[in-house]
C-alpha cells in the first residue's frame, strides 16, 4: 500500500477519505486505527456502526468520527480540533471476522494555523520540512507517494 498524506490545520477539523470497492467490501464494517510505528500494530480508534446497514450513521470516539457510504464506497473519518499529537500513521480498514484488510494507509500531518501567531513556532508550515524522501509537495489536502516510495522509518 502507498501512503497518502493528509494535511490539517491545528485547531481545525480534518477530513480523511478512504475509497474502496463497494462490491468487494459489501457487508463489511470499517475501522480507523492508529499505527504505532511503520511496522508496529494498529490500535483501533473508532469503527462504524455494529449494524452494517446503519454504517452511514456517524460514530464518535472522542474527537474522531467515522461514517461509511457503503453504496458509493467511501469511508470518511473526521478529526475534530486537530492537535500536534494527532500527527502520525493511520489505516482505514475493512473488517471481516477477526481479520482486517487495509483500505488505505494515511499519514496525518498537522500544520500551523497561519492566523495563530502564538503557536507559530510549534507547528509545521508547509514547505518547511518533509516527512518523505523525494515527495511531491502539492497544495491539496492530500497526496499519495510515488510507486515504491515509503515514509522514512523514523524514531520511535
Amino acid at each position: 500500500h502507498n501512503t497518502t498524506v493528509f494535511q490539517g490545520v491545528a485547531g481545525q477539523s480534518l477530513q480523511v477519505s478512504c475509497p474502496y470497492d463497494s462490491m468487494k467490501h459489501w457487508g463489511r464494517r470499517k475501522a480507523w486505527c492508529r499505527q504505532l510505528g511503520e511496522k508496529g500494530p494498529c490500535q483501533r480508534v473508532v469503527s462504524t456502526h455494529n449494524l452494517w446497514l446503519l454504517s452511514f450513521l456517524r460514530r464518535w470516539n472522542g474527537s474522531t468520527a467515522i461514517t461509511d457510504d457503503t453504496l458509493g464506497g467511501t469511508l470518511t473519518i473526521t478529526l475534530r480540533n486537530l492537535q500536534p499529537h494527532d500527527a502520525g500513521l493511520y489505516q482505514c480498514q475493512s473488517l471481516h471476522g477477526s481479520e482486517a484488510d487495509t483500505l488505505r494507509k494515511v499519514l496525518v500531518e498537522v500544520l500551523a494555523d497561519p492566523l495563530d501567531h502564538r503557536d507559530a513556532g510549534d507547528l509545521w508550515f508547509p514547505g518547511e520540512s518533509e516527512s518523505f524522501e523525494d515527495a511531491h509537495v502539492e497544495h491539496s489536502i492530500s497526496r499519495s507517494l510515488l510507486e515504491g516510495e515509503i515514509p522514512f522509518p523514523p524514531t520511535s
Epitope: 492508529r34 499505527q35 504505532l36 510505528g37 511503520e38 511496522k39 508496529g40 500536534p84 499529537h85 500527527a87 502520525g88 500513521l89 499519514l107 500531518e109 498537522v110 507547528l123 509545521w124 508550515f125 518547511e128 520540512s129 518533509e130 516527512s131 524522501e133 515514509p151 522514512f152 522509518p153 523514523p154 524514531t155 520511535s156
Partner: antibody, heavy 120, light 107 residues
C-alpha cells in the same frame, strides 16, 4: 526473552575493516528496523544507518556513506554492520537497535554494545 | 541534517529536586522526538517517545512535552537511579540525529 546479542570486542589496525553482528532472540527481525548507533569514548550517540530486513533495504547517514554496509540474514535473525577504511576516530562502542520505525514506535530494543578499537 | 541542541550540557541536582532538560531542533519535527537515558557502560534506554508518551515500564516522574522545535524532559522528583546522561533524538527525517546529551550529576 527478547534481546539483541552483539559480537565481541575487536581491535583493528587503521585501514582495515570490521564486521559486527547483532543476533535477535525472542522476536523476528523482519518485523523491525535495525539501526546502528555508535558512541566514541566520552562522546554522544551517533546514528550510522538502518536496514529493513524484510525488504533488504538499507539507508546510511551521509557521514558514513560509502564506508558502512548494513546487511541482515533473516534465516538466522542476525543483522551485520561492516565499517571499512577504519581510522582512529572510529574507536567507539557500536550498538544495534531495533524499533518499529518512525511515527510512534513503542518497541525499542538495544544490543549490549561492541567496543571497536582502532590502533596501530 | 536536523541539528538537535540540548541544554544544559550538565547539571547538578539533589534527590527530590525537579529537573528540566530542553531540546531544540533546527527544523520543525512535529512531535517526532524521543528521550533516552544512558548510564555508564550501558546501552541507552527509551524513556519518552512521540514527545510526550511514556515508554512501558518508565516511572511516571518522567514526562515530556513540546512540539515543533522546542521540547522538554522533566523529572518531577529526582531519584538516586536517575543520575545519568539524557539524550533527545529526532525522528522526523533521516539521518536520525541526537542532542549532545545532558549529564545529571549528584550535587
Amino acid at each position: 526473552q527478547v534481546q539483541l546479542v552483539q559480537s565481541g570486542a575487536e581491535v583493528k589496525k587503521p585501514g582495515a575493516s570490521v564486521k559486527v553482528s547483532c543476533k535477535a532472540s525472542g522476536f523476528s527481525i523482519e518485523d523491525f528496523y535495525i539501526h546502528w548507533v555508535r558512541q566514541a569514548p566520552g562522546q554522544g550517540l551517533e546514528w550510522m544507518g538502518w536496514i529493513d530486513p524484510e525488504q533488504g533495504e538499507s539507508k546510511y547517514a551521509p557521514k558514513f556513506q560509502g564506508r558502512v554496509t548494513i546487511t541482515a540474514d533473516t534465516s538466522t535473525s542476525t543483522a551485520y554492520m561492516e565499517l571499512s577504511s577504519l581510522r582512529s576516530e572510529d574507536t567507539a562502542v557500536y550498538y544495534c537497535h531495533a524499533d518499529h520505525g518512525n511515527y510512534g514506535s513503542t518497541m525499542d530494543y538495544w544490543g549490549q554494545g561492541t567496543l571497536v578499537t582502532v590502533s596501530s | 541534517d536536523i541539528q538537535m541542541t540540548q541544554s544544559p550540557s550538565s547539571l547538578s541536582a539533589s534527590v527530590g529536586d525537579r529537573v528540566t532538560i530542553t531540546c531544540h531542533a533546527s527544523q520543525h519535527i512535529n512531535v517526532w522526538l524521543s528521550w533516552y537515558q544512558q548510564k555508564p557502560g550501558k546501552a541507552p534506554k527509551l524513556l519518552i517517545y512521540k514527545a510526550s508518551n511514556l515508554h512501558t515500564g518508565v516511572p511516571s516522574r518522567f514526562s515530556g512535552s513540546g512540539s515543533g522545535t522546542d521540547f522538554t524532559l522533566t523529572i518531577s522528583s529526582l531519584q538516586p537511579e536517575d543520575f545519568a546522561t539524557y539524550y533527545c533524538q529526532q525522528g522526523q527525517t533521516y539521518p536520525r540525529t541526537f542532542g549532545q546529551g545532558t549529564k545529571v550529576e549528584i550535587k
